[in-house]
């Protein structure tokens, strides 16, 4: 299945974080979502074959990239308290 790391992370305000996702083998598309406690998931990015294919309602301090092996990183800079959330990765063909 899809694997993410790290599973838990504690950061202080203003710091930067990098989250990693490995898709299901053979999947070329990776999507990232943010789920704040008590709310539904909010779409952040979709990447397909290393190109950004979709962009959610987040400013540019949220960035992502996809590597040649189709794994992906999500970076969040200048962290705010409101960034505290569950970050989900999904993959598809």
């Amino acid at each position: 299945g899809v694997t993410q790391s790290p599973t838990h992370l504690i950061k202080t305000r203003g710091q930067q974080v990098t989250l990693r996702c490995s898709p299901i083998s053979g999947h070329k598309s990776v999507s990232w979502y943010q789920q704040v406690l008590g709310q539904g998931p909010q779409f952040i990015f979709q990447y397909y074959e290393k190109e950004e294919r979709g962009r959610g309602n987040f400013p540019d301090r949220f960035s992502a990239r996809q590597f040649p092996n189709y794994s992906s990183e999500l970076n969040v800079n200048a962290l705010l308290l409101g960034d505290s959330a569950l970050y989900l990765c999904a993959s598809s063909l």
Partner: antibody, heavy 119, light 111 residues
């Protein structure tokens, strides 16, 4: 070519509301974020907010929450901004502007709609 | 909110000379190797026009006389050489965080 055609000037009374439009052509309207920007006479630029026409998702500058409401009609490729409880400080030129492909910059702008609030 | 301070507020440059406009952000606007600062030109009675995106990338159709540089909090728009058609107000804009903000503008005149 990509174009954003805005509605004409509006003269409205204090306390009234107004809805201005921005009709897009030449690109995939539903999948491109639309932004709105305010410019008071002789002043600088203020970002009001953005809308994703595909699903209506919005984000507002806190300064304009309760003042501006953004909507979009996919069938006509038109974005709208409703301004309520108008006062003299709302007299301005309002621009719609499309998000660029590589970040939240604005690569195509409408010509602007002048809103004048006067009794 | 991120505050963008432009300087000078106005400048007069002779034709053929170099014009330099500064934009300073109240905090870094860099993320993952990109600087999310953009530059626009606005001529009287017209909407703004994108010149430079992500600090140093020239928008399609914009003359190479325009260039941008800088990172983190300090950014510069350079016009070299200045032409008569460049008379306008220039704005910087950050998209690093919400709400997006603009600088107060720099008015360029010909000496």
């Amino acid at each position: 070519q990509v174009q954003l055609q805005q509605s004409g000037p509006e003269l409205v009374k204090p306390g009234a509301s107004v809805k201005i439009s921005c009709k897009a052509s030449g690109y995939a309207f539903s999948s491109s974020w639309m932004n709105w920007v305010k410019q008071r006479p002789g002043q600088g630029l203020e970002w009001i907010g953005r809308i994703y026409p595909g699903d209506g998702d919005t984000k507002y500058n806190g300064k304009f929450k309760g003042k501006a409401t953004l909507t979009a009609d996919k069938s006509s490729s038109t974005a709208y901004m409703h301004l309520s409880s108008l006062t003299s400080v709302d007299s301005a030129v309002y621009f719609c502007a499309r998000r660029g492909t590589g970040g939240w910059y604005f690569d195509v702008w409408g010509a602007g709609t002048t809103v004048t609030v006067s009794s | 909110d991120i505050v963008l301070t432009q300087s000078p507020a106005s400048l007069a440059v002779s034709l053929g000379q170099r014009a330099t406009i500064s934009c300073r952000a109240s905090e870094s606007v860099d993320s993952s190797g990109n600087s999310f600062m953009h530059w626009y030109q606005q001529k009287p009675g017209q909407p703004p026009q994108l010149l430079i995106y992500r600090a140093s990338n020239l928008e399609s159709g914009i003359p190479a006389r325009f260039s941008g540089s800088g990172s983190r909090t300090d950014f510069t728009l350079t016009i070299n050489p200045v032409e008569a058609d460049d008379v306008a107000t220039f704005y910087c804009q950050q998209s690093f965080d919400d709400p997006f903000t603009f600088g107060s503008g720099t008015k360029l005149e010909i000496k």
